[in-house]
């Protein structure tokens, strides 16, 4: 189920690549965030907290990512036209409960000016 389009700027372009921003509520302590391209899982990141508040970050499908207290950024490089697609942030909240899954996303448009290695 798609809950809606992102209510923030999801795509940030720089240096022929794109940063895809996936937000989560900053109250959330344990979660899994997946980046989907269409229906395919491109990246995932799971944050858990153990005893003594030990934080563990795991990735089954690794992408260059960056975690903050309310977002996960996934980075895609060497953009070309094949990257144009719908991208979704699939968030599974584990703690604090209730368990909740939300899917938000948007369409990544690729313009010539954003491509990595344009022929001059």
């Amino acid at each position: 189920e798609i809950n809606g389009s992102a209510n923030y700027e999801m795509f940030i372009f720089h240096n022929g690549g794109v940063q895809i921003l996936c937000k989560y509520p900053d109250i959330v302590q344990q979660f899994k965030m997946q980046l989907l391209k269409g229906g395919q899982i491109l990246c995932d990141l799971t944050k858990t907290k153990g005893s003594g508040n030990t934080v563990s970050i795991k990735s089954l499908k690794f992408c260059h990512s960056q975690l903050s207290n309310n977002s996960v950024s996934f980075f895609l490089y060497n953009l070309d036209h094949s990257h144009a697609n719908y991208y979704f942030c699939n968030l599974s909240i584990f703690d604090p409960p209730p368990f909740k899954v939300t899917l938000t996303g948007g369409y990544l448009h690729i313009y010539e000016s954003q491509l990595c290695c344009q022929l001059k």
Partner: antibody
Framework: QVQLVQSGAEVKKPGSSVKVSCKAS????????MHWVRQAPGQGLEWMGL????????NYNQKFQGRVTITADKSTSTAYMELSSLRSEDTAVYYC??????????????WGQGTTVTVSS | EIVLTQSPATLSLSPGERATLSCSAS?????MHWYQQKPGQAPRLLIY???KLASGIPARFSGSGSGTDFTLTISSLEPEDFAVYYC?????????FGQGTKLEIK
């Protein structure tokens, strides 16, 4: 139906502590986190903190850090909020509120009826 | 701390009129929630995620806005709508409420 029932009114002396209870029914207690919010007379609402029932993880408003302790007893489906070193400014109605999520944010979807705490010498 | 400023502090209207309540945040928030409180009662959730109607809330209530400016609208006031309304943000710690708008009968 989903209900949060809080303990009765308390009158406390400055410097003492108060422990307010919030008994949940109509849902699985460990499936939700619980927040505490207070409202001083004629004032607005103030978030105090929360507890994740299943992990016991707590998160407090820094304003109350060191004075507030939120706990939960899974066996009785009851959450507790204890406030120590009471002063007159702590006179307020204290509410528990159940945590829930929308697509983008979190909110309190069910509230207790409130517990009046009066701090007076 | 994100400060939420509600305006007006008091709004005097008659049943059947349209009410527009504002909530302004001192810095940008991702979403806003709205609560209604009647004397001697606990607050009740009206709107979550800026514009979504909570369960059991009549369709005359609606929410809108983004960034720092949010609005709660009641399209046609019913006698039971006269109460205090609070906005709430859970985007930035510590999580804060507005000071409230009292909606009273004119």
């Amino acid at each position: 139906q989903v209900q949060l029932v809080q303990s009765g009114a308390e009158v406390k002396k400055p410097g003492s502590s108060v422990k307010v209870s919030c008994k949940a029914s109509g849902y699985t207690f460990t499936d939700y986190a619980m927040h505490w919010v207070r409202q001083a007379p004629g004032q607005g609402l103030e978030w105090m903190g929360l507890i994740s029932i299943y992990s016991d993880h707590t998160n407090y408003n820094q304003k109350f850090q060191g004075r507030v302790t939120i706990t939960a007893d899974k066996s009785t489906s009851t959450a507790y909020m204890e406030l120590s070193s009471l002063r007159s400014e702590d006179t307020a109605v204290y509410y528990c509120g159940r945590n829930n999520y929308g697509n983008y944010g979190w909110y309190f979807d069910v509230w207790g009826q409130g517990t009046t705490v009066t701090v007076s010498s | 701390e994100i400060v939420l400023t509600q305006s007006p502090a008091t709004l005097s209207l008659s049943p059947g009129e349209r009410a527009t309540l504002s909530c302004s945040a001192s810095s940008s928030v991702s979403y806003m929630h709205w609560y209604q409180q009647k004397p001697g009662q606990a607050p009740r959730l009206l709107i979550y995620d800026t514009s979504k109607l909570a369960s059991g809330i009549p369709a005359r209530f609606s929410g809108s806005g983004s960034g720092t400016d949010f609005t709660l609208t009641i399209s046609s006031l019913e006698p039971e709508d006269f109460a205090v309304y609070y906005c709430f943000q859970g985007s930035g710690y510590p999580y804060t409420f507005g000071q409230g708008t009292k909606l009273e009968i004119k």
